[in-house]
């Protein structure tokens, strides 16, 4: 399927609007600090060039690869060295090394100002004045802050963003209409970004085989009626799509994702009975819908797994002939029977099965060696079940905020070297598992909770990788993708940690806390809690609770005072002294 001009091919396939949007996303994800106007200029130049290639595929430079064309364009940025430092050295390299170099410099935590939402009238005016620029700016701001955001899905978010403004800017109460929609898009966007970040980490850190195993398990749960060959084909195609997007090949990724959605809808009879509604939607909605579609019903009367994978005399023969195919079949068969298991649990079972066969098939009596392998899965299944049960009970007892605080204390004690903002962000997200998953019945709790925790712990891993400070975090993050959560769960208090020096400034608060939103106020308090644990890692739950209750009362009191600033200064000193005494600081 070779084309004389790759850029012309993608322009024609995607259309001008999507082409321009995807190039903007690609550039913003690579050069995260560049001003919006500079990116728009680069995108326009690339688009004009693409049009010349559509008109004549043999025109000069039209035969160049997209990496070459885009890389050359990025390397024309005048301030590259001043703004990005050593990333400028990428421009001295040739493709494919140059693109790899750009990828390595993507920053998961760029030093960018927080996005502040303007007044609704201001936003609506900007939307009406120049809709195209307004929407481009949305793509730019999201892409530069989330350099691994799934590009075709970002197009879907932008479409919903546009629809929200189109509808709400003519509503009687613009704010009541718009703000909940923007909140929903923000929250969904953060979740989408984190999920995609895990897919990219899986591919980049653990390789294609790890991603394919994940995809086999997930798609087999979702499409239990599909044949193994069908699932394998979907896995191959899905792996190509995500490899491209994670590698910065956004045009190819979006194009291939559209092809995959088309294939799924054309073959839904042999894939799933749940796809009908999705397949009636326009392209972006269709792809999103397929990605989120509920699990199909399991076929009736599926035979026992033991027959083919334990009792058969051909187990070792079948394994030896095609190891990955045989293990893939095991994973497919197990996953389609267990929508109640998390994907990571299914992968742990498959890994255990693989290791067991690897050792047993070399033994004198292989069957005697692996005969009861399925019985040995029991503790692997029970461990996440028990953990989820205990934590959901704790969540129901405490509520989300206090549950987050319990996790903040737990994780700060495990890995106190990690930066306070990272511990707060990650623990808050870990705590959201309660409201997200504990409401579900037993059969849906584990896939919801443990697969969500994998996404959140990956955030910890990628943030920590940028500035590594803890060997324990590095170990849990790098040893095994599927065992990250059990690895972190197994960590006890870090006895080697030397408590942080007490700094009164850390616990000094001002009247500005009173004007913060409830969420921002919680973050302030949770930041103080982490610092408290770093100062006194041996503090008991009761001691910490007492100090935090005093702190909450102090904030409430001073926010009601006439002279707030004086109250914060005077009462704050007393609180610090009382806290020091209570904790023996």
């Amino acid at each position: 399927d070779a084309h004389k001009s790759e850029v012309a091919h993608r322009f024609k396939d995607l259309g001008e609007e999507n082409f321009k949007a995807l190039v903007l996303i690609a550039f913003a994800q690579y050069l995260q600090q560049c001003p919006f106007e500079d990116h728009v200029k680069l995108v326009n130049e690339v688009t004009e060039f693409a049009k010349t290639c559509v008109a004549d595929e043999s025109a000069e430079n039209c035969d160049k690869s997209l990496h070459t064309l885009f890389g050359d364009k990025l390397c024309t940025v005048a301030t590259l060295r001043e703004t990005y430092g050593e990333m400028a050295d990428c421009c001295a390299k040739q493709e494919p090394e140059r693109n790899e170099c750009f990828l390595q410099h993507k920053d998961d935590n760029p030093n960018l100002p927080r996005l502040v939402r303007p007044e609704v009238d201001v936003m609506c005016t900007a939307f009406h004045d120049n809709e195209e620029t307004f929407l481009k700016k949305y793509l730019y701001e999201i892409a530069r802050r989330h350099p691994y955001f799934y590009a075709p899905e970002l197009l879907f978010f932008a479409k919903r963003y546009k629809a929200a403004f189109t509808e709400c800017c003519q509503a009687a109460d613009k704010a009541a209409c718009l703000l909940p929609k923007l909140d929903e898009l923000r929250d969904e966007g953060k979740a989408s970004s984190a999920k995609q970040r895990l897919k990219c980490a899986s591919l980049q850190k653990f390789g294609e085989r790890a991603f394919k195993a994940w995809a086999v398990a997930r798609l087999s749960q979702r499409f239990p009626k599909a044949e193994f060959a069908e699932v394998s084909k979907l896995v191959t195609d899905l792996t190509k799509v995500h490899t491209e997007c994670c590698h910065g090949d956004l045009l190819e990724c979006a194009d291939d994702r559209a092809d995959l959605a088309k294939y799924i809808c054309e073959n839904q009879d042999s894939i799933s009975s749940k796809l009908k509604e999705c397949c009636e939607k326009p392209l972006l909605e269709k792809s999103h819908c397929i990605a989120e579609v509920e699990n199909d019903e399991m076929p009736a009367d599926l035979p026992s797994l033991a027959a083919d994978f334990v009792e058969s005399k051909d187990v070792c023969k079948n394994y030896a002939e095609a190891k990955d195919v045989f293990l893939g079949m095991f994973l497919y068969e197990y996953a389609r029977r267990h929508p109640d298991y998390s994907v990571v649990l299914l992968l742990r079972l498959a890994k255990t099965y693989e290791t067991t066969l690897e050792k047993c098939c070399a033994a004198a009596d292989p069957h005697e060696c692996y005969a009861k392998v399925f019985d040995e899965f029991k503790p692997l299944v029970e461990e996440p079940q028990n953990l989820i049960k205990q934590n959901c009970e704790l969540f129901e007892q405490l509520g989300e905020y206090k549950f987050q605080n319990a996790l903040l204390v737990r994780y700060t004690k495990k890995v106190p070297q990690v930066s306070t903002p990272t511990l707060v962000e990650v623990s808050r997200n870990l705590g959201k598992v309660g409201s997200k998953c504990c409401k579900h019945p037993e059969a849906k709790r584990m896939p919801c909770a443990e697969d969500y925790l994998s996404v959140v712990l990956n955030q910890l891993c990628v943030l920590h990788e940028k500035t590594p400070v803890s060997d324990r975090v590095t170990k849990c993050c790098t040893e095994s993708l599927v065992n990250r959560r059990p690895c972190f769960s197994a960590l006890e208090v870090d006895e080697t940690y030397v408590p942080k020096e007490f700094n009164a400034e850390t616990f000094t608060f001002h009247a500005d806390i009173c004007t913060l939103s409830e969420k921002e106020r919680q973050i302030k308090k949770q930041t103080a809690l982490v610092e408290l644990v770093k100062h006194k890692p041996k503090a008991t739950k009761e001691q910490l609770k007492a100090v935090m209750d005093d702190f909450a009362a102090f904030v409430e009191k001073c926010c009601k005072a006439d002279d707030k600033e004086t109250c914060f200064a005077e009462e704050g000193k007393k609180l610090v002294a009382a806290s020091q005494a209570a904790l023996g600081l």
């Epitope: 742990r348 099965y353 050792k359 009861k372």
Partner: nanobody, 124 residues
């Protein structure tokens, strides 16, 4: 990585009893089989007993059947070997070993992790 530490070795009279213990640490949240091996002076290291992760299946070498009992507490990541009716020919360095996976492994080559060993001497 799984780290293993044996304890409980010592000098015992023929017909006496001894209990060896092995504590595992490290990556103990993945399934692993545990076993005991022994090596007498100038001899090959031989398999004594093994037990799976759940402790639901066990294996014993011919020379110790009926006298030795292997047990495991997965929650505490410990394994023990109760040795009764000890004979002079049981004198050896006893090694605790662990192997990834969930099979009942009986061969030395199947084991991935080893302890330092503890001396058992049966003599009057």
């Amino acid at each position: 990585e799984v780290q293993l530490v044996e304890s409980g070795g010592g000098l015992v009279q023929p017909g006496g009893s001894l209990r060896l213990s092995c504590a595992a640490s490290g990556r103990t949240f993945s399934p692993y089989t545990m076993g005991w091996f022994r090596q007498a002076s100038g001899k090959e290291r031989e398999s004594v007993a093994a037990t799976t992760w759940t402790g639901s299946r066990s294996y014993y070498g011919e020379s110790v059947k009926g006298r030795f009992t292997i047990s495991r507490d997965s929650t505490k990541n410990t394994m023990s070997l109760q040795m009764n009716s000890l004979k002079p020919e049981d004198t050896a360095v006893y090694y605790c070993a662990a192997a990834d996976g969930a099979g009942l492994y009986t061969n030395r080559g199947q084991y991935d992790y080893w302890g330092q060993g503890t001396q058992v001497t049966v003599s009057s």
